[in-house]
Structure formats: structure tokens, C-alpha cells
């Protein structure tokens, strides 16, 4: 059962101090959507008991384990349901409190009833004002049932309820007639889906026989013990003071558990602390009773002292519940009370035993749930105890439940019963997840899903290329972190499944279903170097590289340029898409701007180790285009060109550059530059005859211009081949003439 | 679906006795209190007795006290009223019906007549 | 045990609203807030129209309400239809278990 308290403190004189606590065991209990699981939820259940609304109750959180409702202003706020909800997914629990009012008309002699399927469950209410009008039973808040005034036996209204049903179970309410709500008793009946020592699906197993008033839960068969008690069979006493399943909580407060009401989960229901009773939980136990409520009879022999804590404390020589076995008798040593395999296992389980007469090899016997006896194969004899070695049998899930050691001398017999748990191997729903790939290796989550039993202690992740008929790679990894494949080949589809362990032999789960993981292409290897650069305006630059001459073929799909523009913080990428390439023109640059230039190889998605940068200053904008260009043959060998200076001039022009070109042709232009730019014509010489060239011009300042209009013009028939255009301007002309 | 029906009545002469029951379904009857309640021809509704769910408690109308007992079999589901000292003016349809805490009768029998003549 | 009194008549055009009264003693109607109230056509059962002074069950027309004052209940019937021609009966839980029904009202629409 899950390992959750509801902790009730009854001093009612004041409900400003009034609380309510719950309190988890779990591991991981509280901590949210973070951690294990949700967070611990105390509220009142206003669905069945509704009471007048009030200021809202405080909810503090206490550590993980630990919640808190307070802010009770006044008596009525106290009455009726709350619960509180702890436990992750099939584990989640509801332990629920039932609080009546101290004044109320009617009070219930006891609140909590917790009954076997097929019992007779009594309710009885007991008279604290009497009215002489009808009682009316109430279950879940729907009408039940009418009892007459008169009907009261010794000041008290019973409600029989014959052969109880699971449905039965449910919160229940006896009120006068014409009386507040706040003035019933409350009950809380908590029917068992079992008859009486028996649990699970139809009911076929025996209940381990819980002590000290624990109650077998229908379900699994273990014992929820009473605030105070532990062990598989509640047969140990917690200190005084102490609860929880592990006796690991303290009650608050200098007078240990006094004034509270506990709580547990279903079948138990609530109760006082060990050693104390009363409808307010303040009363000590009497003499020779002891345990929750006060509920237990020491009846302690030979000599035993009763405390109301824990029971009998025997004097030396004795033991046993009322201290009726000698030490003479053999006793069970030591015996773990719960014991876990994993399924399909042959473990060895140790029963240890002393006693007089002194127990033999054959004196101890274990039998299984389902009756088989299993002997010994070896026993160790040591001075103070013997024992047994048992080797069981292949496990199955149906020998989880309760095992039993028992030893038989002539000196009488003992026995001990301890659960086992047969837990099943994990073994994942899914395939592992491929979060990120290289060439030579892969990032896989490997944490999926999976049926069976946790925890899981180990993942192993086993991997091998597909199709392939070799072993398969194995790595054991942290199951909480992210696994990396390395030393993969590139560009290979890799099978990858996973094998979940949890703890103890035989815990490893079969393999989970495979997938396929690609690694990536091989990353290129050759680094390029920039060749060179030229400026070819002030927003384009044309780039050169080289590659390293290796032998096979090029790894590699392309290049990537980058350019660096440090103070604007930018940078621009330019993909160049084939291997081959070993130039490029960048357009769109920023004139005035300092780059910084590298190219580096690509292949797929994988980048190459970049060039050694270049540091490039591209010349700030240049002066508007001249305007009116104008061509005019004068020769077979000679035209001339005419224009007017640019409008809107930043500064003094430094000169003018022509671009002359042959109309179709597929050469490079040629740069001539005009260097007196206060004139306005010049004379381009050497040229072809009857060929009909292009031309266009630009200023320069500090920076070259923009282009002007291109304009076409073709030199007269029947000259020679000249040697190549060159320039004359008007002012070189004429002074040639003089 | 809630059923009440009754049965017994008939012609009787005045002193004698007649015993009426009421067969009910639909409900768990065991926890609910009954009552009979009459109507003389042409006259209005009358309360006659009640009976509380475990039979220990009954309550009669003056007009009836001491020669009318009201009982119930719980394990048969069914009402009884047994009218000894029949009068004249004990003639009427009578009605079982099932009570509910505050005393309203939300389910009612079609009724069956007695008649007392001579 | 005395009977509850009730006109022994009253009548309304259809669409109309009627009240009817139902007075008790403090033993009854003025202890308890458990008075009810039937309908019965002619040669049927009665049917409970209201519980607990003002209550309806489901099923009933909320053209039917309930309240009290005092010793006196009332019943009323707002937008009064052909079909509400019928008998009413007011009923009261009393002091002493017992229950006492009224004298009955005869409703006509005209």
C-alpha cells in the first residue's frame, strides 16, 4: 500500500489551531510534474457533507513529503470530509478523514468501519441532544433510511446493514429531522472486496494474518498496519511517537501522538496513535490495552509487562506476542519480511533458526503460496543457530504472494511468513530515439516506454550496421542520460535496439523492437586557400581559391563563402553549388565596408575546415554616372566619345574610367581611365575596323562611380588590324595638331 | 420504476375484519416508511397510519386507533392493514403510498375499495 | 387530530393565477416545514405537486409553487390551464409523527 498519512489534530477548543497534515513515505512524493510524479492534494470534499462557505483554507507545503491545510475559523469549518491524494499513476491514493462536530445532536460511537464483503455492518449514533422527532440515515448524502424517535436503544440509533457489498462503502450520516446537517453523526464504511482473511482477483488468496489490528488490503494481500506498527505482518512495534510504514515520521509536538486522528489508506481508515483512544484521541490507553484505539489486549504470561505502545515486554527466557513461547521453543531467526526476484529466476532463500533442541537441516521447511513444501539442500550449523539453504524452483508471477519458513523441533514450532514479489523484466515498447548524427557517430536517447517492472538499473544499447551478420556492438549506459554511438562508418544505416535491466539476477528484459539510424556524410577534410580578390565596384568583389591536389576523388558538394562584416555585426553567406568552381563575383556588398573573407568545403550538411581569412576593404560609393554619353567614329581605327559631367558631385573627380568592349564577344572588357577629368571628350584609338563596339563610363572620387548608359558605335570599313584600342583626349589632340 | 399496488378489499359486513396488502417494487422497500391513506366516496383524502421502515414504530389516525394494526414483511415487499371492527364509515378507497422524511407521500398505489354493509 | 382547512373551491380563467390556502395550527403546518401538496383528478391517485412548503418534484410544471406563513400554506397556479382542473389536498407532518391532510379544494377553470 502506498506509504500516505492524514494526520487530524483534534484540540477542538480552538479551531484557529486546528490542522490537518499529510504526510508520504513515497519516494519522490510531493515533488510535482519535476520529479516522480504529481504533488501531494489535501482539500475538503464539499461533494456529500456541504457546510456554509467561509474564508479559503491554507495550504502549505512542507518539503516534498509534507502538506498542510490550516485557516479553520470556526467549528462548522471543521465538519465533514477531507482527503488527501498522494501516490504516481496505478499507485495514486486517497486516504480520507471524516470529522464530526464535538455539539452535534448525534455522534457517532465510532467513525471508521471498516467491514469484510458479506458482513453485517452496525453504525450506531449516539444521542448528545436528544430530539424527539425522526432520525434519518443518509448514505453518500442520499436518503437510506428512517428510525422513529422511539426506536433508540440505551440512547442510541443503530443502522444494521446486512450482507455489505464493496458498493456499500461510502460516507454515512444519521440526523434528526428539522436538524442542521452540522448536527449528524458521520460514518465512514469501508467495505472490503473480500470476505474475511482472503484478497485479489476472486478472492482466492489467504491473507498473511495482519497483527495488532492491521487489515489485509483486498488487492495486494499486504497489511496496512495501524499508526505505530511495521512489518509485513504489522508484528513490530514502532517507538513511541513514531509512524509510517518504516516507523520514519515523528508525531508533532511534546506530547507525542495525543490528540491526533490518523488516517491511512482504504481498507484501514482512521484511528487514534498507538497507546491512546477517545473521540479526541487524549485519553490514554487503560491498563492491559494497548495499540490504536486502544483496541488490543495485552493478556501478557509468564511474567510480561504491558505497554501501551508495543504490547508484551516478556522477561528474559520468553517471547512471543503474549510472551507464551520460551526461548526454549525454536524461533525464526531474523527473517526479511518481503523478498524480491525477478521472474523465471532460481534463487536460494536462507531461513535461520535456533532453539532447543537444536534445529536441523531437516526441522526447516518453506512452503509456497500455492502449498508446495520445499526442503533444504544445505544448512550451515553455527553455535547460536542454523540455516537452511533452500534453492526454488524456476519462478512464476503466480508464486508472488506469501512464503512461509517454519522450523519443528520436540520443543514445539515457529513460523514466519514473508512475502515474495515476483517482478517481471522490463522490456522497452519502443525503439530508442535518434537525437542528433555525424558522420562517425550517433546521440540516442535511449529511455522508452516499457512493460513489465521497474526500476530500471542499467540500459544497455546494442547496435550493428544493417544487414549485417556480425555480432552486435553492446554499451551499458546511466538510464537517465543520453547515450553517444562513436567510431561509426559514414553515411551507413546502423540497426539500434535497446535491453532494459532492473535490479537483481536475472533482471535483464528481452531486447526491444530495432530502428534504423543513419550516420551522416563524411565531413570533407581539404582545407581551401584564397587565391585572390579584386575589387569590382564598390558593392561587388570577385573571389579566387584553390584546393589542395589529393588523390581520389573530391569529398564535397560545394563552397561556402563568408563575409564578415564586424561593425555592423552581419554576415553573408554565399553558396557556390559546385565542387569545381574556383571563382565567384559577390553583388550586394556594402561599399566603404571592411571584410573579413573565408571559403570553406561543404559536403551534405557537413562544413570543412575554413580557408585562412582575408581582410578585404571594399572603397566607399563613387560619384553619380556621367550623363549623355555619346559615340562617333572618326576612322577605320578611331571613334570618340562625348558627355557631360555628372550632376550633384560629392567632391572633385579624380578621373574617368571607359569600359570598352567588342559587341558580342566573349572576352574580358577593357578598364581605360581618363585621367584630366575636367574633359568632357576623348578619343579611343586601335581599334578594328568595321567592328561595332560597346561603351560605357564612370567617374571616380574616392571611390568608383556608377556606371553610365552603355552606348554602341562601329569604326568605318577597310583599315587594318590594329594593335588595340588606347585613348587620346581632346587637349592631347590638339596640341599633336599645333 | 416504483410500483405500488394493493389488494384485499371487498364487501364487509359492519363488526367484521378485512386484511389489505400492498405489493411494492422498484425500490428498496425495506428502507422506506409506509402509509395508508383513504377516501370515502365523494369525501376527501384521509391519513390512516404509518409504518417506519424496520416495523418498530407505528402511528394510527384517532379515528382508527386500536382496530387497525399496520405491519410490513420486509423480506416480501409488501404492506399490510389489518381492519378489524369494520364501520360503515370505514368505507373508502384505500391507498398504500411511500413516505419520505418530512412526511410527503411521492408514490401512490391506484387504491382498492372496502366496502362496509350490512 | 383535526383536518387542515381549504376552501372548499376555487376558480380562474385559463391563463390566470389562483391561491390556494391551507391553514393548520402551530402543532402542524406552523412546526414543520414539511408540508405537501397533491393533486387528484377524478377516479385516479393523488400526484405530489410540492414537498417541504416549496419544493417540486422533477416532472412537475413550475407553473405550481409553495410557501407558508405562519399556520397557513399556500399553494399557487400561475397561467392556469384546462388540465389543472382538479382536486388539491394540502398534507402536514405534526408534532407527533403523524400526518394530517387538508379538507380539499376543488379547482375549476372557467
Known amino acids: 500500500a502506498v506509504d500516505l498519512t492524514l494526520l487530524a489534530n483534534l484540540r477542538l477548543t480552538d479551531p484557529q489551531r486546528f490542522f490537518l497534515t499529510c504526510v508520504s513515505g513515497e519516494a519522490g512524493a510531493g515533488r510535482g510534474s519535476d520529479a516522480w510524479g504529481p504533488p501531494l492534494l489535501l482539500e475538503k470534499d464539499d461533494r456529500i457533507v456541504r457546510t456554509p462557505p467561509g474564508p479559503p483554507l491554507r495550504l502549505a507545503r512542507n518539503g516534498s513529503h509534507q502538506v498542510t491545510l490550516r485557516g479553520f475559523s470556526k467549528p462548522s469549518d471543521l465538519v465533514g470530509v477531507f482527503s488527501c491524494v498522494g501516490g504516481a499513476g496505478a499507485r495514486r491514493t486517497r486516504v480520507i478523514y471524516v470529522h464530526n462536530s464535538p455539539g452535534a445532536h448525534l455522534l457517532p460511537d465510532k467513525v471508521t468501519h471498516t467491514v469484510n464483503k458479506g458482513d453485517t455492518a452496525v453504525l450506531s449514533a449516539r444521542v448528545h441532544k436528544e430530539k424527539q422527532t425522526d432520525v434519518i440515515w443518509k448514505s453518500n448524502g442520499s436518503y437510506f433510511y428512517t428510525l422513529d424517535w422511539h426506536e433508540a436503544q440505551d440512547g442510541r440509533f443503530l443502522l444494521q446493514l446486512p450482507n455489505v457489498q464493496p458498493p456499500s462503502s461510502g460516507i454515512y450520516s444519521a440526523t434528526y429531522l428539522e436538524a442542521s446537517p452540522l448536527g449528524s453523526a458521520f460514518f465512514r464504511l469501508i467495505v472490503r472486496g473480500c470476505g474475511a482473511g482472503r484478497w485479489g482477483p476472486g478472492c482466492t488468496k489467504e491473507c498473511p494474518g495482519c497483527l495488532h489490528g492491521g487489515v489485509c488490503h483486498d488487492h495486494d494481500g499486504e497489511c496496512v498496519c495501524p499508526p505505530g506498527f511495521t512489518g509485513t505482518r504489522c508484528e513490530q512495534a514502532c517507538r513511541e511517537g513514531r509512524f509510517g510504514q518504516s516507523c520514519q515520521e515523528q508525531c508533532p509536538g511534546i506530547s507525542g501522538c495525543r490528540g491526533l486522528t490518523f488516517c491511512l489508506p482504504d481498507p484501514y481508515g482512521c484511528s487514534c496513535g498507538s497507546g491512546w483512544r477517545g473521540s479526541q484521541c487524549q485519553e490514554a490507553c487503560a491498563p492491559g490495552h494497548f495499540g490504536a484505539d486502544c483496541r488490543l489486549q495485552c493478556q501478557c504470561q509468564n511474567g510480561g509487562t504491558c505497554d501501551r505502545f508495543s504490547g508484551c515486554v516478556c522477561p528474559s527466557g520468553w517471547h512471543g506476542v503474549h510472551c507464551e513461547k520460551s526461548d526454549r521453543i525454536p524461533q525464526i531467526l531474523n527473517m526479511a519480511s518481503e523478498l524480491e526476484f525477478n521472474l523465471e529466476t532460481m534463487p536460494r532463500i536462507n531461513c535461520a533458526a535456533a532453539g532447543n533442541p537444536f534445529p536441523v537441516r531437516g526441522s526447516i521447511e518453506l512452503r509456497k503460496p500455492d502449498g508446495t513444501v520445499l526442503l533444504s539442500t544445505k544448512a550451515i550449523v553455527e553455535p547460536e543457530k542454523t540455516t537452511a539453504e533452500f534453492e526454488v524452483p524456476r519462478l512464476v508471477l503466480a508464486d508472488s504472494g506469501f512464503w512461509e519458513c517454519r522450523v519443528s523441533t520436540s520443543g514445539g514450532q515457529d513460523s514466519r511468513r514473508f512475502k515474495v514479489n515476483v517482478k517481471v523484466p522490463p522490456v522497452p515498447l519502443a525503439a530508442p530515439r535518434l537525437l542528433t548524427k555525424q558522420s562517425r557517430q550517433l546521440v540516442v536517447s535511449p529511455l522508452v516506454s516499457f512493460s513489465g517492472d521497474g526500476p530500471i538499473s542499467t540500459v544497455r544499447l546494442h547496435y550493428r550496421p544493417q544487414d549485417s551478420t556480425m555480432d552486435w556492438s553492446t554499451i551499458v549506459v546511466d538510464p537517465s542520460e543520453n547515450v553517444t554511438l562513436m567510431n561509426l562508418r559514414p553515411k551507413t544505416g546502423y540497426s539500434v535496439r535497446v535491453q532494459l535491466s532492473r535490479p537483481g539476477e536475472g533482471g535483464e528484459g528481452a531486447w526491444g523492437p530495432p530502428t534504423l539510424m543513419t550516420t551522416d556524410c563524411p565531413e570533407p577534410l581539404l582545407q581551401p586557400w584564397l587565391e585572390g580578390w579584386h575589387v569590382e565596384g564598390t558593392d561587388r568583389l570577385r573571389v579566387s581559391w584553390s584546393l589542395p591536389l589529393v588523390p581520389g576523388p573530391l569529398v564535397g558538394d560545394g563552397f561556402l563563402l563568408r563575409l564578415w562584416d564586424g561593425t555592423r555585426g552581419q554576415e553573408r553567406r554565399e553558396n557556390v553549388s559546385s565542387p569545381q568552381a574556383r571563382t565567384a563575383l559577390l553583388t550586394g556588398l556594402t561599399p566603404g565596408t571592411h571584410y573579413q573573407l573565408d571559403v570553406q568545403l561543404y559536403h551534405c550538411t557537413l562544413l570543412g575546415p575554413a580557408s585562412p581569412p582575408a581582410h578585404v576593404l571594399l572603397p566607399p560609393s563613387g560619384p553619380p554616372a556621367p550623363r549623355h554619353l555619346h559615340a562617333q567614329a572618326l576612322s577605320d581605327s578611331e571613334i570618340q566619345l562625348t558627355w557631360k559631367h555628372p550632376e550633384a558631385l560629392p567632391g572633385p573627380i579624380s578621373k574617368y574610367v571607359v569600359e570598352v568592349q567588342v559587341a558580342g564577344g566573349a572576352g574580358d572588357p577593357l578598364w581605360i581611365d581618363v585621367d584630366r577629368p575636367e574633359e568632357t571628350s576623348t578619343i579611343i584609338r586601335g581599334l578594328n575596323a568595321s567592328t561595332r563596339y560597346l561603351f560605357r563610363m564612370r567617374a571616380s572620387i574616392q571611390g568608383l562611380g556608377d556606371w553610365s548608359n552603355t552606348v554602341e558605335e562601329s569604326t568605318l570599313g577597310n583599315g587594318l588590324q590594329a594593335e588595340g584600342p588606347v585613348q587620346e583626349s581632346r587637349a592631347a589632340e590638339e596640341g599633336l595638331d599645333q | 420504476e416504483v410500483q405500488l399496488l394493493e389488494s384485499g378489499g371487498g364487501l364487509v359486513q359492519p363488526g367484521g375484519s378485512l386484511r389489505l396488502s400492498c405489493a411494492a417494487s422498484g425500490f428498496t422497500f425495506s428502507h422506506y416508511k409506509m402509509a395508508w391513506v383513504r377516501q370515502a366516496p365523494g369525501k376527501g383524502l384521509e391519513w390512516v397510519s404509518v409504518i417506519y421502515p424496520s416495523g418498530g414504530a407505528t402511528y394510527y389516525a384517532d379515528s382508527v386507533k386500536g382496530r387497525f394494526t399496520i405491519s410490513r414483511d420486509n423480506s416480501k415487499n409488501t404492506l399490510y392493514l389489518q381492519m378489524n371492527s369494520l364501520r360503515a364509515e370505514d368505507t373508502a378507497v384505500y391507498y398504500c403510498?411511500?413516505?419520505?422524511?418530512?412526511?410527503?407521500?411521492?408514490?401512490w398505489g391506484q387504491g382498492t375499495l372496502v366496502t362496509v354493509s350490512s | 387530530q383535526s383536518v387542515l382547512t381549504q376552501p372548499a373551491s376555487v376558480s380562474g380563467s385559463p391563463g390566470q393565477s389562483i391561491t390556494i390556502s391551507c391553514t393548520g395550527t402551530?402543532?402542524?403546518?406552523?412546526?414543520?416545514?414539511?408540508v405537501s401538496w397533491y393533486q387528484q383528478h377524478p377516479g385516479k391517485a393523488p400526484k405530489v405537486m410540492i414537498y417541504?412548503?416549496?419544493n417540486r418534484p422533477s416532472g412537475v410544471s413550475n407553473r405550481f409553487s409553495g410557501s407558508k406563513s405562519g399556520n397557513t400554506a399556500s399553494l399557487t397556479i400561475s397561467g392556469l390551464l384546462a388540465e389543472d382542473e382538479a382536486d388539491y389536498y394540502c398534507?402536514?407532518?405534526?408534532?407527533?409523527?403523524?400526518?394530517?391532510l387538508g379538507t380539499g379544494t376543488r379547482v375549476t377553470v372557467v
Open positions: 398534507s402536514s407532518y405534526t408534532s407527533t409523527a403523524t400526518y394530517v
Open positions: 403510498a411511500r413516505a419520505l422524511p418530512g412526511g410527503y407521500f411521492d408514490y
Open positions: 417541504d412548503v416549496s
Open positions: 402551530s402543532s402542524d403546518v406552523g412546526g414543520y416545514n414539511y
